[in-house]
Amino acid sequence: HRRLDKIEDERNLHEDFVFMKTIQRCNTGERSLSLLNCEEIKSQFEGFVKDIMLNKEETKKENSFEMQKGDQNPQIAAHVISEASSKTTSVLQWAEKGYYTMSNNLVTLENGKQLTVKRQGLYYIYAQVTFCSNREASSQAPFIASLCLKSPGRFERILLRAANTHSSAKPCGQQSIHLGGVFELQPGASVFVNVTDPSQVSHGTGFTSFGLLKL
């Protein structure tokens, strides 16, 4: 079988060679070939070349479309880890440390406080805040965690909020709040997490984190 295949290949190769040689002879205007024959062979050859070029163009287009699609919709995702802060601010601090995610420069962590996006679209935004508090040591007000948004030219606004009453456990009882939702973000929009008492937030591995994902 293999031998027959080889003979077939050689025969095809010989035919191709004869065909190319004939085109060459047509081009040099050899008298032994009729004009009609030459025209037929030339148009056949032009057809082959056209097909090859069209195929090349199509492949090029497909590839460039794939690239464009990839460029237009790159994965945008971030997951950052809580960072203890000496600042008295109620806005939680985050860091790119541990098992964090920062997909590309289309999302950035700015001033350690906010995740800022460069592209408009729908994003799933989430935060988990673990805190340790005691009823006696804390004020009457509950512990509140807020997921907030600041868009260019607009006031800060609360997107999501959750409240937990303080524990009676001593010295303090651990509790976790999880916030998550889908929101339309504009280019340059920043999201951040605000809490009533940042000193009660737990910064142990996996307890407090914040992130987003473009849908």
């Epitope: 030219g153 607009r154 800060e156 920043s190 951040f192």
Partner: nanobody, 129 residues
């Protein structure tokens, strides 16, 4: 209530600099969005710059971008406006404004006068040679 008092205005030559201050008293505006507006003679009051209450994010009018800087002190009781490369068209009375975070309105744009709850009396800035 919150009282806002501006200071630092005066006469300055074109290309010069000036720093305005706005002191807040009363219910200290720990969670207030603060802004500067200005009103030139015979013109409407216009937005200059704003700073957000929690993040301290800033927004500027196109006419002052790159020349003016809004900031506040750590206690959030004093607001500043650093004005550089001043031009004659910057001549106006400059007002400090504050908005409570609980303020409810149909618009959330920082450059709209109606979105602010408290106003100072203003300080005059004259840019002339």
């Amino acid at each position: 209530d919150v009282q806002l008092v501006e200071s630092g205005g005066g006469l300055v030559q074109p290309g010069g600099s000036l720093r305005l201050s706005c002191a807040a008293s009363g219910r200290t505006p720990l969670n207030y969005h603060m802004a500067w507006f200005r009103q030139a003679p015979g013109k409407e009051r216009e937005f200059v710059a704003a700073i957000s209450s929690l993040l301290g994010s800033t927004d500027y009018a196109d006419s002052v971008k790159g020349r003016f800087t809004i900031s506040r002190d750590n206690s959030k009781t004093t607001l500043y406006l650093q004005m550089n490369s001043l031009r004659p068209e910057d001549t106006a009375v400059y007002y400090c404004a504050a908005r409570e975070t609980t303020h409810i309105s149909t618009s959330d744009r920082v450059n709209e006068i109606r979105n602010y709850d408290y106003w100072g009396q203003g300080t005059l800035v004259t840019v002339s040679s």
